[in-house]
């Protein structure tokens, strides 16, 4: 008799999830010699232990603490790049500007990037059929709690000038409900962070508006200022040229505004 299984609204666990996480851990330790002390088997066991046999709507940050401990990593606190709704460009940037880091450039972020996972209460099985959707089912699901946990820790570690890349093509350039707006903004430490500098990325080629004057950016400035952190904002009118100039800063066309 087939066992009844909870149907959730979101997609199920990414296929070959255990192998993918293990493979990413191996690759990360290969690329980052300073992380060769990390035992990838222990990392996988801790990752799995955070959600296996637990109700996927009842996951807590505490469940992920063993994994957090194993994945402890020191990144230069003044080289942190946060992003909201513009992940690909942020990652392209840190691939060129190798001394800056997004969350996904750290081990834990790298392991989980673009993956979905969940288990079932009282069984050791991974649910490949469906997982809870943040809106339709529950917010305390394995994926959301993971990202909330690692994002909070990442923001807490930041110091000096913190940069954030924001998508100027969206109706809400700054969204209070995004991970950046709901977690990272509130976990920057005013005693360590001097300035939050927003880079607003323009989408249209002929878009010459000053998106730093957008109401949602003003809202971000207000939140940040109230937390005793300075705020600055720059328009990136030509993201393609911006990346090109990061690659080749000596290029003569890179002296003008981008």
């Amino acid at each position: 008799v087939p066992r009844w299984r909870q149907q959730w609204s979101g997609p199920g666990t990414t296929k070959r999830f255990p192998e993918t996480v293990l493979a990413r851990c191996v690759k990360y330790t290969e690329i980052h010699p300073e992380m060769r002390h990390v035992d990838c088997q222990s990392v996988w066991d801790a990752f799995k232990g955070a959600f296996i046999s637990k109700h996927p709507c009842n996951i807590t940050e505490e469940d992920y603490q063993p994994l957090m401990k194993l994945g402890t990593q020191t990144v230069p606190c003044n080289k942190i790049l946060l992003w909201s709704r513009i992940k690909d460009l942020a990652h392209q940037f840190t691939q060129v500007q190798r001394d800056m880091f997004t969350l996904e450039d750290t081990l834990l972020g790298y392991l989980a990037d673009d993956l979905t996972w969940c288990g079932e209460f009282n069984t050791s099985k991974i649910n490949y059929q469906s997982c809870p959707d943040w809106r339709k089912d529950c917010s305390n699901n394995p994926v959301s709690v993971f990202w909330k946990t690692v994002s909070r820790r990442f923001a807490e570690a930041a110091c000096d000038v913190v940069h954030v890349m924001l998508n100027g093509s969206r109706s809400k350039i700054f969204d209070k409900n995004s991970t950046f707006g709901s977690v990272e903004v509130h976990n920057l430490q005013p005693e360590k962070v001097q300035t939050l500098e927003a880079w607003v990325i323009h989408g249209g080629r002929e878009d010459s508006r000053d998106l730093c004057q957008d109401p949602t950016i003003k809202e971000l400035e207000s939140i940040i200022s109230k937390r005793n952190i300075q705020f600055s904002c720059k328009n990136i009118y030509r993201p393609d040229k911006f990346l090109q100039c990061v690659k080749n800063p000596e290029d003569s066309s890179c002296t003008s505004e981008i």
């Epitope: 255990p18 192998e19 293990l22 493979a23 851990c25 191996v26 690759k27 330790t29 290969e30 060769r36 002390h37 990390v38 035992d39 990838c40 088997q41 222990s42 996988w44 066991d45 799995k48 050791s124």
Partner: nanobody, 122 residues
């Protein structure tokens, strides 16, 4: 190119001991989990023992638990298998294998060596 070269096999009497070694090259040894697998004459492959990339975690098949000891030296890129209290049913070709690790009973293997023959007979 990945190379896994096993050595140390041979003929040994029941109850005797043997130490197998595997020299690895062509990849970042310290990032990979390693295993020993074996194939007895006319039989399928059997996973024997494994060790995580740092050596913190070790695993054994029930059939060899308490008799075999796996170890690695990441500074020398070597994997060893100390086999004690050998029995006739341990006779097999022993292969060194590199991989990503384990999930439960599943071993995610990437590469395997050519093997070394262990014969346990009086």
């Amino acid at each position: 190119e990945v190379q896994l070269l096993e050595s140390g096999g041979g003929l040994v009497q029941p109850g005797g001991s043997l130490r197998l070694s595997c020299a690895a090259s062509g990849f970042t040894f310290s990032s990979y989990a390693m295993s020993w697998v074996r194939q007895a004459p006319g039989k399928g492959l059997e996973w024997v023992s494994g060790i995580s990339n740092t050596g913190i975690n070790t695993y054994y098949a029930d059939s060899v638990k308490g008799r075999f000891i796996i170890s690695r030296d990441n500074s020398k890129n070597t994997l060893d298998l100390q086999m004690n209290s050998l029995r006739a049913d341990d006779t097999a070709v022993y292969y060194c294998a590199s991989g990503k690790g384990w999930d439960g009973n599943t071993w995610y293997e990437d590469y395997r060596g050519q093997g070394t023959l262990v014969t346990v007979s009086s």
